[in-house]
């Protein structure tokens, strides 16, 4: 079906939606992916929660946004921003970013277009 896109709504409403959801499970899920299940990640007690469980909780949280698809970019950017200072080196930043980019598909959403994940002003 052909469609012509109108306005997507305003980004401030996305920021409000992103603020309302708990992105911790997404952050934990990605950190587990890049650190490996067997390693302990200091910032969270993740030993008791399997990565697949975290992924499901993450997807559930993202689904809580009124317009998940439109606000996906802001959510991913917020996750990146939240974890930026915990990423120890350039390689870890790139790994985190790669996993973050795969997150929408893991949750059965479309990857956001035009989404710049380099949001930390060079910190990350």
């Amino acid at each position: 079906m052909r469609r012509e896109r109108g306005r997507q709504g305003d980004s401030s409403s996305c920021e409000r939606q992103v603020d309302r959801v708990n992105l911790k499970p997404c952050e934990q899920h990605i950190m587990q992916r890049i650190m490996g299940e067997q390693e302990q990640y200091d910032s969270y007690d993740i030993r008791s929660t399997r990565s697949s469980d975290q992924q499901q909780r993450c997807c559930d949280e993202l689904n809580e946004m009124e317009n998940t698809q439109r606000c996906m970019c802001e959510a991913l950017q917020q996750i990146m921003e939240n974890q930026c200072d915990r990423l120890q080196d350039r390689q870890m930043v790139q790994q985190f970013k790669r996993e973050l980019m795969n997150l929408p598909q893991q949750c059965n959403f479309r990857a956001p277009q035009r989404c710049d994940l380099d949001v930390s002003g060079g910190r990350c």
């Epitope: 079906m1 052909r2 997507q8 980004s11 401030s12 956001p112 035009r114 710049d116």
Partner: antibody, heavy 123, light 110 residues
Framework: EVQLVESGGGLVQPGGSLRLSCAAS????????MTWIRQAPGKGLEWVAN????????DYLDSVRGRFTISRDNAKSSLYLQMNSLRAEDTAVYYC????????????????WGQGTLVTVSS | QSVLTQPPSVSAAPGQKVTISCSGT????????VSWYQQLPGTAPKLLIY???KRPSGIPDRFSGSKSGTSATLGITGLQTGDEADYYC???????????FGGGTKLTVL
Amino acid sequence: EVQLVESGGGLVQPGGSLRLSCAASGFKFSTFYMTWIRQAPGKGLEWVANIKQDGSEKDYLDSVRGRFTISRDNAKSSLYLQMNSLRAEDTAVYYCTRNGLQDSYSGDFFDHWGQGTLVTVSS
Amino acid sequence: QSVLTQPPSVSAAPGQKVTISCSGTGSNIGHNYVSWYQQLPGTAPKLLIYDNTKRPSGIPDRFSGSKSGTSATLGITGLQTGDEADYYCATWDADLSAVLFGGGTKLTVL
């Protein structure tokens, strides 16, 4: 070598119509977003419209939405801009551009431009 | 009035460095990628930088791009007289569902 050649510009009265065409060659047309960009005499660049690879999504500048229609024919490697209800402020050189936007995590960028075709709306 | 703000003009001597700023908001530069274009007098624009920092093949490394928050910057080092042109930034605006161009900056090499 990538080439974009626009045609169809000219002088038209306010309220009139024109159809711009862009013949593309030197690349696989069906795999790229395409974009029309215009430049009024002595002014800056202004984006007009985007069309997705398969034509399923189109975006327009607010001031042309409902008056202009972007379309493409991938079999002919051609891009079109149907312009209706033309106004004096639509007077500009219209550029056909190839847009490097991919499906995710990339931005719009215009890596190849035609030479432009001048549209003059005047009575 | 463009939503992306650029200085109308900048100037510097040959061999010097110049930067051109492009200021926007969270709904455009803040969330999306920036590209830069050079338009020599009487010609079509040419892509200089895309996805904030990347250079297309054939663009010398004298040209660089960066982005921080809601602003982007084009840097040109080793200025040459042939760099005299108009320079434009561009990005997508999620609120408008449209590509925005800056108003353009005229570079004069003194």
